[in-house]
Interface confidence: low
């Protein structure tokens, strides 16, 4: 049988009673000789093909219990006719056997007289008939075939005889094995009950583990249910808090960069003005009026308009307002608020543990009391009483069997000796026939006359006639033995062995009021004095065969209902009522008004409305109107084209100044522009869809807040119920298992069914009836064939 299933008990949490090992095999293997037994069964089926006569047997048994039987009653006559009809095959065989018994001695006697008067064969002919040799051959072959058939029959007899001896010897061991199994049943049962009780502690430990770790089991369950709706929102807010910090950093960087740029640009502008002034002053040199220097000077004068700083760098709007806004936003510690949110979630298991200390203690008290209740119930089980009574019966039966086994073995020796004599006698007859045939064939001389034939040939004839004589003397005695064993063996096989195997015999015994006219069901009347309770031999035998427990097999629930006494519902109800007082209050903090305002302020801080393109446009432009290095080199080249003197030197000095301006002014501006670009990009990324993001986060926040407001209590209730179901599940499962084990597994009555099988199926049918039937089948066949043998021998 399987385990009782409990929906809430963990699947892996299965109990198993330790297996009880029994010694006795519950089926008997005949071995190769089984083929011979099957042959007899086939013969019996031919002789007796009708189904087991349940009704006839019932009526017969009812008549047998009557004190005085009226044979003239029609129903008695009909019953008699039914018995005759069923036994027709056997009766017919008996009639033929009786004819054989009566006729064989008479025929033998007359044949002997006839032979003595030289009338019945044995006369000597001078000349052979034409068909004489052919007839002789036919007779010899026929006799040989018949002798072989007789020999097979004798072989069957020997085998059967040997089987009886060896099998009866095995009976003692078989009986001991059965009694050992019955003792095992008696001894194991208290151990099984102890084991069942011990499993309560295992169950209780499992529940205690869950109770002790209520923080992770219940708290964790609640947390797992809430997490998916809250953590994503907190994560989003956390990422927004990071974004605010990054924005502040970017704005600060941008601000300082812009300030640097303004200063650097002004300085560049100032420097370029100075150098332009210097160049203009240089170009006032009189040399510039003289050709070809005048062209160079004009070229330089024209190029001066290029020496301008990019004025737009100084016009880039500030980000003070945005930075102020972000700084205001950062006054609220959004990170801290988010952390509070996470913390309030992570605190759930501990809060659950703190709030359930009393309830857990209460449940533990209930669980401890259930243990003692179960102990009381198992103490009162009637299994022990039945087993005690059964123990007495087992002891009596064992001593009875041990007392009578020597007698059985003694009778078996007589049977074996008788069988040996019978088989030996038949063997002697068939040996004479074989010798007669052998001598006849070996000593035959077709030219010799009857008076001059050889000694061997003559001896052959003598052997044949001795065989015939012995056949006439003993075959009728053998047939008596065959008929008697046949009637007994065939009826036992047909009326006990076969219906026992098919359980039809149990159905007869289960007939209401049959074995006791006061009891509807014999077994329940005998065991419990409650004959109305349906307890049948067939059901008890089948249940025991299936290894079912005594409690379930004998329907002990009628005298002690374990379900009522265990009262699963009452126990689980006690746990449930304790669990009902399990109340958990959670305070989950999400963000609060300050946090919400913080997000809204950040959304309104203006970084999404900044004109990033104007900043980015400037980062791509040159700080000066021209590449100052190129301008300086060009100026140097032009200066070099002038004749040596003040003009040339001052121009070269100015070129050098421009290079310095590039180095000291332009390069730092380019560096600042690169920094500005990075800051703008960060801000652009953060500002992109900021309002939508914050709106979405606030919507998620509202959803999460609604979820907490509307669902937290139902989540707690559901998880608490689930937790309760798990705890209760352990005990429901355990109590169902107890019920199942006591009903189906404890004190398995299989040894009883095995003992019955041993007594009927093995001992009676396999050890006695099968060899007995093979014996009469073999000897009967040999005896029957003695008749044609003696005819052909004569």
């Amino acid at each position: 049988g399987g385990q009782p299933s409990s929906t809430d008990a963990p699947k892996a949490w299965n109990y198993e009673l330790p297996a009880t090992n029994y010694e006795t095999q519950d089926s008997h293997k005949a071995g190769p000789i089984g083929i011979l037994f099957e042959l007899v069964h086939i013969f019996l089926y031919v002789v007796q093909p009708r189904d087991f006569p349940e009704d006839t047997l019932r009526k017969f048994l009812q008549k047998a219990y009557e004190s005085k039987i009226d044979y003239d009653k029609p129903e008695t006559v009909i019953l008699g006719l039914k018995i005759v009809y069923y036994e027709a095959g056997i009766i017919l065989c008996c009639v033929l056997g009786l004819l054989f018994i009566i006729l064989m001695p008479l025929v033998g006697y007359f044949f002997c007289m006839c032979r003595c008067c030289n009338k019945c064969g044995g006369e000597m002919h001078q000349r052979q008939k034409e068909n004489g040799p052919f007839l002789r051959k036919c007779f010899a072959i026929s006799l040989l075939v018949i002798c072989i058939i007789i020999s097979i029959g004798i072989f069957y007899g020997f085998v059967a005889n040997h089987q009886v001896r060896t099998r009866i010897k095995r009976s003692r061991k078989l009986a001991d094995s059965n009694f050992k199994d019955l003792r095992t049943l008696l001894n194991e049962t208290p151990e099984q009950i102890k084991y069942i009780l011990a499993q309560y502690n295992t169950t209780k430990d499992k529940a205690f583990t869950d109770l002790n770790s209520i923080n992770s089991v219940l708290g964790g369950g609640i947390l797992d249910r809430l997490r998916p709706n809250i953590i994503p929102v907190l994560d989003e807010i956390k990422s927004m808090a990071t974004a605010i910090k990054e924005t502040k950093e970017a704005l600060e960087n941008m601000n300082s960069t812009l300030k640097s740029l303004h200063q650097q640009s002004t300085q560049l502008s100032s420097s370029l003005t100075s150098v332009k002034t210097s160049l203009r002053s240089s170009l006032n040199d009189p040399l510039c009026l003289v050709h070809p220097s005048s062209e160079t000077c004009n070229s330089i004068r024209l190029s001066l308009s290029q020496l301008n700083s990019n004025p737009e760098l100084r016009q880039l709007p500030p980000v003070d307002a945005e930075l102020d806004n972000v700084n205001n936003v950062l006054r609220t510690d959004l990170d801290g608020l988010v952390q509070q949110g996470y913390q309030s979630l992570n605190d759930i298991p501990d809060r659950v543990q703190r709030q359930t200390t009393t309830v857990v203690a209460g449940i533990k008290r209930v669980l401890n009391s259930i243990g003692s209740d179960i102990d009381n119930v198992t103490q009162r089980l009637p299994i022990q009483d039945i087993l005690s009574a059964f123990s007495v019966y087992v002891n009596n039966t064992e001593s009875y069997i041990h007392r009578n086994l020597p007698t059985l073995e003694e009778y078996d020796s007589y049977w074996w000796l008788g069988g040996l004599v019978i088989c030996s006698l038949l063997t002697l007859i068939v040996i004479f026939y074989y010798l007669g045939l052998l001598c006849g064939v070996c000593g035959y001389d077709r030219h010799a006359t009857p008076t001059t034939r050889g000694c061997v040939s003559n001896t052959g004839g003598v052997f044949l006639m001795v065989g015939v004589g012995l056949s006439f003397l003993f075959c009728w005695i053998l047939m008596i033995i065959v008929v008697l064993t046949f009637v007994f063996g065939a009826n036992v096989e047909k009326l006990i062995c076969e219906p026992y195997t098919s359980k039809e015999l149990f159905r007869v015994l289960d007939t209401p009021y049959l074995l006791n006219e006061d009891w509807e069901y014999y077994l329940s009347g005998k065991l419990f004095n409650k004959s109305k309770m349906k307890l049948t031999f067939e059901q008890v035998y089948s249940d025991c065969k299936k290894n079912r427990g005594t409690y379930g097999t004998l329907h002990l629930q009628n005298s002690f209902n374990i379900s009522e006494h265990l009262n699963i519902n009452e126990h689980t109800g006690s746990i449930s009522s304790e669990l009902e007082s399990l109340k958990v209050n959670l305070n989950i903090f999400l963000l609060g008004a300050a946090g919400r305002k913080n997000l809204q302020d950040f959304a309104a801080c203006g970084i999404d409305r900044m004109n990033y393109d104007s900043y980015l446009a400037q980062t791509g432009k040159s700080p000066a109107g021209v590449n100052l290095l190129s301008f300086a080199y060009d100026l140097e080249a032009k200066a070099n084209s002038l004749p040596p003197g003040n003009l040339r030197n001052s121009l070269k000095r100015d070129a050098q100044t421009i290079k310095t301006i590039h180095q000291q002014r332009v390069l730092p501006i380019e560096q600042s522009l690169s920094t500005l670009y990075q800051s703008v990009k960060i801000l652009q990324r953060t500002g992109n869809g900021l309002l939508e993001r914050v709106t979405r986060i606030l919507a998620s926040l509202d959803f999460a807040q609604n979820f907490i407001t509307n669902n937290t209590s139902s989540v707690i209730i559901e998880e608490t119920k689930k937790y309760g179901r798990t705890i209760i599940g352990y005990f429901e499962h355990y109590l169902q298992w107890i019920e199942f084990s006591i009903s189906e597994k404890v004190a398995s009555c299989k040894p009883v069914a095995t003992a019955l099988d041993t007594a009927v199926d093995v001992f009676l049918c396999s050890y006695i009836i099968d060899p007995l039937n093979l014996f009469w089948f073999g000897i009967g066949k040999a005896t029957v064939f003695l008749l044609p043998a003696l005819i052909f021998a004569v």
């Epitope: 601000n255 300082s256 300030k259 303004h262 502008s269 370029l272 003005t273 004025p311 760098l313 016009q315």
Partner: antibody, heavy 117, light 106 residues
Amino acid sequence: EVKLVESGPELKKPGETVKLSCKASGYTFTDYSMHWVNQAPGKGLKWMGWINTETGEPSYADDFKGRFAFSLETSASTAYLQINNLKNEDTATYFCATDYGDYFDYWGQGTTLTVSS
Amino acid sequence: DIVLTQSPAIMSASPGEKVTISCSASSSVSYMYWYQQKPGQPPRLLIYLVSNLESGVPARFSGSGSGTDFTLNIHPVEEEDAATYYCQQYHSYPPTFGAGTKLEIK
């Protein structure tokens, strides 16, 4: 709140030297350039020049090169304007102003300098 | 240096009227700034980058223009608006101010 507080009115004789101060508060001093603007009585505003508060490097308008000097005391968040060899035409109100690029967003209350023999 | 010419130099207006002050640059500039100065006080920034209103400045002030011609409008003018108004550029070094327009309220 950003504040620029200038030193009190000054009365000087020609040829003397004066040092006007401008104390900044409410922001990081080195973040903004400091400019000086002059306003002669009944006249318009005239830009004198500026000082890079990060590097301390001054830059002067053409009309104010020579006798005028800008300096800093960064630790005290203070900028100074020193005028040497004062002349009667130096009589004016002197403003310090921080710039945010192309314009002057915060101004000191102004220091009145009177040069008279 | 870029020269800024403001017109008119002096003007008067009654409360509720619309006042327009012009500023003309000697060469093209990208941006223009406007300041208000009351007697005994430092200048106060009104408009930056041609048309942007500085925080705290009433909405009746507005700026417009491009290239060399820029305008400051006050509508409706109020008594407290009596002051001298300056335009300023920093497009080209050095920064320069206009000579100022004095607004009187009748």
